[in-house]
Amino acid sequence: FNMDTRKPRVIPGSRTAFFGYTVQQHDISGNKWLVVGAPLETNGYQKTGDVYKCPVIHGNCTKLNLGRVTLSNVSERKDNMRLGLSLATNPKDNSFLACSPLWSHECGSSYYTTGMCSRVNSNFRFSKTVAPALQRCQTYMDIVIVLDGSNSIYPWVEVQHFLINILKKFYIGPGQIQVGVVQYGEDVVHEFHLNDYRSVKDVVEAASHIEQRGGTETRTAFGIEFARSEAFQKGGRKGAKKVMIVITDGESHDSPDLEKVIQQSERDNVTRYAVAVLGYYNRRGINPETFLNEIKYIASDPDDKHFFNVTDEAALKDIVDALGDRIFSLEGTNKNETSFGLEMSQTGFSSHVVEDGVLLGAVGAYDWNGAVLKETSAGKVIPLRESYLKEFPEELKNHGAYLGYTVTSVVSSRQGRVYVAGAPRFNHTGKVILFTMHNNRSLTIHQAMRGQQIGSYFGSEITSVDIDGDGVTDVLLVGAPMYFNEGRERGKVYVYELRQNLFVYNGTLKDSHSYQNARFGSSIASVRDLNQDSYNDVVVGAPLEDNHAGAIYIFHGFRGSILKTPKQRITASELATGLQYFGCSIHGQLDLNEDGLIDLAVGALGNAVILWSRPVVQINASLHFEPS
């Protein structure tokens, strides 16, 4: 209708990075920009994804290098994290959120794909990381090894081998394990502190240089107390599980201090593993009963989990695996490891800014049934798995509904702001829920809409539209882009109109009648009034139309509803040659060229396209005759 197709601004980018996957218009004190997501962008050797800022009129795009943002205190894996897969602008302060739903971090032997988002302020400066699903690793441990280095330990090289082998089993790194070593005899010394080394390689290297310090006495109580009061303090981390491993070959010369030392360790929640090396006793034919009792006393309860004894120093190698396994059984204590909560949540798969924070879709949460999390300045709200049961019953829990594939919100005059989320795989047909979130981690689900067709991906795209701009939502549009019709993936967009408290189904939007795949409804954007009739409008993308070149459809709002026949269909081929997947993302909230008209930004594979609005001239014809 009034979108100019003759002089679009086609902003080129990398196809391999999928520049254009997401687009958002951006305003910084009058300067207009396009923010473009490129979720497969490379940073160095890693395919992190990134976000570009592109000037609207002319000039080249600049990478924001958000892919370089690192989270401290986690062993992160940024490769393939898909930064820019979702973008959400906050019109209040013109900041935006760029999400990396496949951002993962190492936890023990696993990588947890919790996802994370970067908040970028209005002048394109990174301001904060938003990662509500990120939880401390179960391997967030401070381990202090307390080594008996008294004269009776022989040969020392066996102790060293044991130390190196056990260290190789530890998941050492930021947000995981830190290791410190103290050696004792008559005195106690720090061999190295908890925060001296940040990798297995470095710790092993340091351990290989520890020499036996000797001593005629074995002050085990003092060694343990030194570890508790000093070693765990120097470089120890708040909230880290404290683990102590005591290795000794004889009764202590300060055993009357053990009671108090162990009490203090208990108070500090130090889990103690104790290893009795019986070499000295066996070489001399001494009964080790008193010694073994002492080591059992040192070890945390129950003994069968925390106490080890070996025949001699050489046999230490035989307990490496068992000791490692027992320490890491602390990881998932009483936890059903076959079930995932937020570990694979992929938070930020979708995002939506609300008044008090941001909603983040987490499609992988709760065994890929999905969830919606909320991050606010006051904290985060993570609804419990049970809070979804009303609409996502237990018997379908293995289906992977992907709730949070898209998130938005609606405003009704009765209920105020209500959140909306799509679960396109629910029971194979898809579902959309409208809900409010509570700080006690529960939800109230007000309404649910279900898809009609298996595999249609109903709910993979949702947009709320305030047609008349009165602050109350009039229409909710739900996309089912894989809707199969007439032998093709045609796609469908369902229209729901707000009647009092409920959204009532009111037909579907009409697409063109071609006989190719289209995926109409892959993207749906509520845009500000394009045709200057004072009603806000809607643009729908069909990125597979025209043999994957893509097309968009413009639908006009009218009197609290939406006209279901498109007023304009714009195909990629009209705009430029070589465009592909045009319409995969759409945003239209700003006047980009200062002509007083709202312009459109549309994403394509390797391109972002700006379509300028043209003024609409209203001609009122009137006839009058003379003479009358």
Epitope: E217, R219, A221, F222, E225, E251, S252, H253, D254, S255, P256, D257, L258, E259, K260, I262, T290, N293, E294, Y297
Partner: antibody
Framework: EVQLVESGGGLVQPGGSLRLSCAAS????????IHWVRQAPGKGLEWVAS????????YYADSVKGRFTISADTSKNTAYLQMNSLRAEDTAVYYC?????????????WGQGTLVTVSS | DIQMTQSPSSLSASVGDRVTITCRAS??????VAWYQQKPGKAPKLLIY???SLYSGVPSRFSGSRSGTDFTLTISSLQPEDFATYYC???????????FGQGTKVEIK
């Protein structure tokens, strides 16, 4: 030769204070524990308190807890028993004794004792 | 706290007699039990440690044994210099709390 010598005993009024010393020689205080044991006239042995001079951990009998304080000065190789709020029932001969690993946690050397009399 | 109940509180015996003194612990304890001899006006002297080990310089007629919570000091052939008071002592494991028995006075018959 291992020796323990107590001093500081004497006559004191109820409610008064006294500080006993136990000077050790022939061994290092840091490698052992010192215990104070008392014996009221005509009565048996009663354990009073102990200290590890290395770690400074202390233990007390319930009858003296809060009134007596055991301490050690390793530079002087001497242990002390500070006795406050003395009562008539604290009247006894006070012995210090060595307690260590090499005697399998038995009191192998004792001082000659010092008499403390609490009387008005 | 562990109590050590010593019996008898006194006994009369003749030179050459075999004398047995028993200490019963109120609960199961380690073998860290010692026996002392004290003569009037003198400090106690260590005889037995670890329930049954003879301290150096102590005559071999003195011996100690353990049976469950019962600890026994035996003088196989009483000598004139053995007339004294004998105390058992128990060390609480892993602390330096100690407890004495009430004492057994061995007198000449």
């Amino acid at each position: 030769e291992v020796q323990l010598v107590e001093s500081g005993g004497g006559l004191v009024q109820p409610g008064g204070s006294l500080r006993l010393s136990c000077a050790a020689s022939g061994f290092n205080l840091t490698s052992s524990y010192i215990h104070w044991v008392r014996q009221a006239p005509g009565k048996g042995l009663e354990w009073v308190a102990s200290i590890s001079s290395y770690s400074s951990y202390t233990y007390y009998a319930d009858s003296v807890k809060g009134r007596f304080t055991i301490s050690a000065d390793t530079s002087k190789n001497t242990a002390y028993l500070q006795m406050n709020s003395l009562r008539a029932e604290d009247t006894a001969v006070y012995y210090c004794a060595r307690y260590w690993y090499y005697s399998a946690w038995a009191l192998d050397y004792w001082g000659q004792g010092t008499l403390v009399t609490v009387s008005s | 706290d562990i109590q050590m109940t010593q019996s008898p509180s006194s006994l009369s015996a003749s030179v050459g007699d075999r004398v047995t003194i028993t200490c019963r612990a109120s609960q199961s304890v380690s073998s860290a039990v010692a026996w002392y001899q004290q003569k009037p006006g003198k400090a106690p002297k260590l005889l037995i440690y670890s329930a049954s080990s003879l301290y150096s310089g102590v005559p071999s007629r003195f011996s100690g044994s353990r049976s469950g919570t019962d600890f026994t000091l035996t003088i196989s052939s009483l000598q004139p210099e053995d007339f004294a008071t004998y105390y058992c002592q128990q060390s609480a494991p892993y602390s330096s709390l100690i407890t004495f028995g009430q004492g057994t006075k061995v007198e000449i018959k």
